[in-house]
Interface confidence: medium
């Protein structure tokens, strides 16, 4: 807390300037109209004032605004953003995309901070869904947006938005999210031709139901196997020999790589030998010859 | 810690162009980077400052038009750069840099220099 | 533009007080910085904003700022802090920064 102390004789200030760098920090809090500052605000980023300095700065601001800042002067926050709690941030109402442009700008190239992870969560519920330009501009700053948001957050972005985002925006998602994701990117890369909508739907498969990946490996997609194993296990399971053949093409060689680890192992499990076999990779751990295989899920269905 | 490290000693003629660099680890919005220089057996000089997150950057009158600072964040280096070298321009030169925010020593930033680099000797000789 | 005045030279008898003196027009209204340089290394800041101390820089370092003249002062002088000491404040029309003009302490 600066005490309060009156502003020497001349150093009012009558406009925001660099010359405010040398005052000391009772004589910002003295000298400098929180009016003035709140007016001026666009002209503070070009200076280099100290944290310090900063810090008087907002506790202006705070006096003056005491129930949230209006969004003329968030836009112009710049660094004294950096400055800012999430609990000064829960008071503000965002609605303009080009301020939270603005306030991202700032804290570019840092993880993302519990104000700016505040200031997207206050701008977002203002919108009602996460938008295409929202999510377009979430993504550039932070790839990992999308994948920290629960399943139910997810559940509001429409289809239309899913086209923003890029393969790495997805690195860090678990099956549930992507569970959410899938039938969007889905709905949304639904006109698309075979292969331009392999290409585009590829990231979201580990959503992918078992009948959409017996469907794709009608379509010769040639499927990685860095893809493939981020299938989910149960809806892999179900596919034959052939088809998890016809889906990962040549690269269906990779699976022996890979046989000690899910879903891989899990399917290995359920095949016959002499199916795996056929594939001539040297796949062990199928069902051997001349045992009968019972899928109980579907005999308790039918009951 | 901070540390600067600026490039080796350079031995120059008149009227050639030189760039010596002050590299840091880390940066902050609120680093910034002076240029002090020291001819032989003087005092300290201010020539100027730069604060790359404010585009800002100031020299001293007497290096106003003599030298050219600059930096690159991305790579959190300062630099000071000289179109004609001149003999008078013979010194050590150091950089200096304060980092804006609560650290190891105290709450203050870059109009206070608490990281200094090594040193670069330029010498300017026919 | 703003100049610093320090006195060339200070002597002092080990375990005594040396106090060093930084003089000019605009002290009162700015910081004042100061740095320690022994022969053959770069400064070293002991004092901040008038009588801050970093950490690291011993206690028998201390500083004040009043009227137009800002003070360093070393009590217990030791050995060690032999060496030139400069102040630095800031000349306001110019927004650079300035250098006092060294002062060389003598630890007799």
């Known amino acids: 807390e600066v005490e309060k102390t009156a502003c020497p004789s001349g150093k009012k200030a009558r406009e925001i300037d660099e010359s405010l760098i040398f005052y000391k920090k009772w004589e910002l809090e003295a000298c400098v109209d929180a009016a003035l500052l709140a007016t001026q605000m666009d002209r503070v980023n070009a200076i280099p004032f100290t944290y310090e300095q900063l810090d008087v700065l907002k506790h202006k601001l705070d006096e003056l605004y005491p129930q949230g800042y209006p969004e003329s002067v968030i836009q112009h926050l710049g660094y004294l953003f950096l400055k800012m709690s999430p609990e000064d941030i829960r008071k503000w109402n965002v609605t303009s995309l080009e301020t939270l442009k603005a306030l991202l700008e700032v804290n570019k190239g840092h993880e993302m901070s519990p104000q700016v992870a505040t200031l997207i969560d206050r701008f977002v519920k203002g919108r009602g869904q996460l938008d295409k330009d929202t999510l377009d501009t979430l993504t550039a700053f932070y790839p990992g947006y999308l994948c920290s948001l629960s399943p139910e957050e997810l559940s509001s972005v429409p289809p239309s938005s899913i086209w923003a985002v890029r393969p790495q925006d997805l690195d860090t998602c678990d099956p549930r999210q992507l569970d959410v994701l899938y039938p969007k990117a889905r709905l949304a890369f639904q006109n698309m031709n075979g292969s331009e909508y392999f290409v585009k739907i590829q990231s979201f498969l580990g959503g992918a139901p078992t009948e959409d990946l017996k469907a794709l490996s009608q379509q010769n997609v040639s499927m990685d196997l860095a893809t493939f194993m981020k299938l989910r296990t149960d809806a892999v399971l179900p596919l034959t020999v052939a088809e998890v053949q016809k889906l990962l093409g040549p690269h269906v060689e990779g699976l022996k790589a890979e046989e000690r680890h899910r879903p891989v192992r899990d399917w290995i499990l359920r095949q016959r030998q002499d199916d795996l076999d056929t594939l001539g990779l040297g796949l062990q751990g199928g069902i051997p010859n001349g045992y009968l295989v019972l899928d109980l899920s579907m005999q308790e269905a039918l009951s | 810690q901070v540390q600067l490290v600026q490039s080796g000693a350079e031995v120059k003629k008149p009227g050639e162009s030189l760039k010596i660099s002050c590299k840091g680890s880390?940066?902050?919005?609120?680093?910034?980077w002076i240029w002090v220089r020291q001819m032989p057996g003087k005092g300290l000089e201010w020539m100027g400052i730069i604060h790359p997150g404010h585009s800002y950057t100031r020299y001293s009158p007497s290096f106003q038009g003599q030298v050219t600072i600059s930096a690159d964040k991305s790579i959190s280096t300062a630099y000071l750069q000289w179109s004609s070298l001149k003999a008078s321009d013979t010194a050590m030169y150091y950089c200096?840099?304060?980092?804006?925010?609560?650290?190891?020593?105290?709450?203050?930033?870059?109009?206070?220099?608490?990281?200094w680099g090594q040193g670069t000797l330029v010498t300017v000789s026919s | 533009d703003i100049e610093l005045t320090q006195p060339p030279s200070v002597s002092v008898a080990p375990g005594q007080t040396a106090r060093i003196s930084c003089s000019g027009d605009n002290i009162p209204n700015f910081y004042v910085h100061w740095y320690q340089q022994k022969p053959g290394q770069a400064p070293v800041l002991v004092i901040y904003?008038?009588?801050d101390r970093p950490s690291g820089i011993p206690e028998r370092f201390s500083g004040s700022n009043s009227g137009n003249t800002a003070t360093l002062t070393i009590s217990g002088t030791q050995a060690e802090d032999e060496a030139d000491y400069y102040c630095?404040?800031?000349?306001?029309?110019?927004?650079?920064?300035?250098f006092g003009g060294g002062t060389k302490l003598t630890v007799l």
């Open positions: 200096a840099r304060g980092d804006g925010g609560p650290s190891s020593q105290g709450n203050y930033f870059g109009w206070v220099y608490d990281v």
């Open positions: 904003e008038d009588s």
């Open positions: 880390g940066y902050s919005f609120n680093t910034s």
């Open positions: 630095q404040s800031y000349d306001k029309p110019t927004f650079s920064g300035v």
